[in-house]
Amino acid sequence: MKVLQEPACVSDYMSISTCEWKMGGPTNCSAELRLLYQLVFQSSETHTCVPENNGGVGCVCHLLMDDVVSMDNYTLDLWAGQQLLWKGSFKPSEHVKPRAPGNLTVHTNVSDTVLLTWSNPYPPDNYLYNDLTYAVNIWSENDPAYSRIHNVTYLKPTLRIPASTLKSGISYRARVRAWAQHYNTTWSEWSPSTKWYNSYREPFEQR
């Protein structure tokens, strides 16, 4: 049994780090493998993560962690029974993938504006809370050629779009993702999408 692609880990900078790797052949990850992790810190103990399958040869492990601080460094040991398959380390603050924003809502009753709001996925005491910027993807299932990305570089999790810039009488979908500039993170996963019908019609005089 051997590792084909070494574990790569990302942290949500809150309570979970996710490690993914690939094995040399089909593996029952939860039955055959264990990922042991330990914070390099006075009197820390070793903790065990039971991996799940992620495709035929892929494994994924969700490591429970305390709040992340920049000094934190973990040793990682991947075991198959008594056999050490791989040894490495992981500094969560240097491999951050933010949590996806949630509660994406579309408000269409605001005169001639489509208002999108969503929730910051972090509590106010988390360092990422005030560092997130967003990308909102809007597309139309009726008009495959229409897809736009709106970059939200201010802190407030809202986006206003003039309804007149969207075609009337068709449905649109939106989703949002986040990243934290000062922490050099990757983009989060996209939030679940939300759908709305654009019923806005220009005033008669403007037609």
Partner: antibody
């Protein structure tokens, strides 16, 4: 009441051995790291050794490394310090102390918040 | 090893007056914001040491509020706002960021 009680001290000749014990009560013993600190007559405090809650990690002062062994029996809520190859400079009052909560991912530290009453070790010929 | 240096080593104080003890570490004992791994202990004559302050500025349970700790990184201070007769003894700072844990030399507080 959270309490630590040491025992096992006494008079021993240079080169001899002693085993100190420290019995804990009033807290979940296995969840906490434990530490030994000593104080030579008329001197300050000196850290000797520490052990994590599950016993998997042990730490020693250079002055005792290779001669002293720290261990614990969580089923008996007891901490030990096996002292071999004793020297005159090991003469001191030995205290055990409750250290950090080590079962959490990042151990939680509240200081050495409980100390035993101390047990005296005298090494002399 | 991290060296902890205390001053003064002797501190005569009049009851009711404030007192201050300084402790300097040879390298930073700050692990993350708010987590300075420095404690203060008081050892009264013939007794075991007792914890006063942990993590630089957190008062241990049952410790009177006249005791306070401050500082960050390498410089720390224990203050007693109004010294009482029962406060006499040796005061030690200690770092526990990493082993070996190291203590200051101790400060003897005595009543004038």
């Amino acid at each position: 009441e959270v309490q630590l009680v040491e025992s096992g001290g006494g008079l021993e000749q240079p080169g001899g051995s002693l085993r100190l014990s420290c019995a804990g009560s009033g807290f979940t013993f296995r969840d906490f790291a434990m530490t030994w600190v000593r104080q030579a007559p008329g001197k300050g405090l000196e850290w000797v050794s520490s052990i994590s809650g599950d016993g998997s990690n042990t730490y020693y002062a250079d002055s005792v490394k290779g001669r002293f062994t720290i261990s614990r029996d969580n089923s008996k809520n007891t901490l030990y310090l096996q002292m071999n190859s004793l020297r005159a400079e090991d003469t001191a009052v030995y205290y055990c102390a409750k250290d950090r909560l080590s079962k959490t991912i990042r151990p939680r530290y509240y200081g050495l918040d409980v100390w035993g009453q101390g047990t005296t070790v005298t090494v002399s010929s | 090893d991290i060296v902890m240096t205390q001053s003064p080593l002797s501190l005569p104080v009049t009851p009711g007056e404030p007192a201050s003890i300084s402790c300097r570490s040879s390298q930073s004992v700050l692990y993350s914001i708010g987590y300075n791994y420095v404690d203060w202990y008081l050892q009264k004559s013939g007794q075991s040491p007792q914890l006063l302050i942990y993590l630089g500025n957190k008062r241990a349970s049952g410790v009177p509020d006249r005791f306070s700790g401050s500082g960050s990184g390498t410089d720390f201070t224990l203050k007693i706002s109004r010294v009482e007769a029962e406060d006499v003894g040796f005061y030690y700072c200690m770092q526990s960021l990493q082993t070996p844990y190291t203590f200051g030399q101790g400060t003897k507080l005595e009543i004038k």
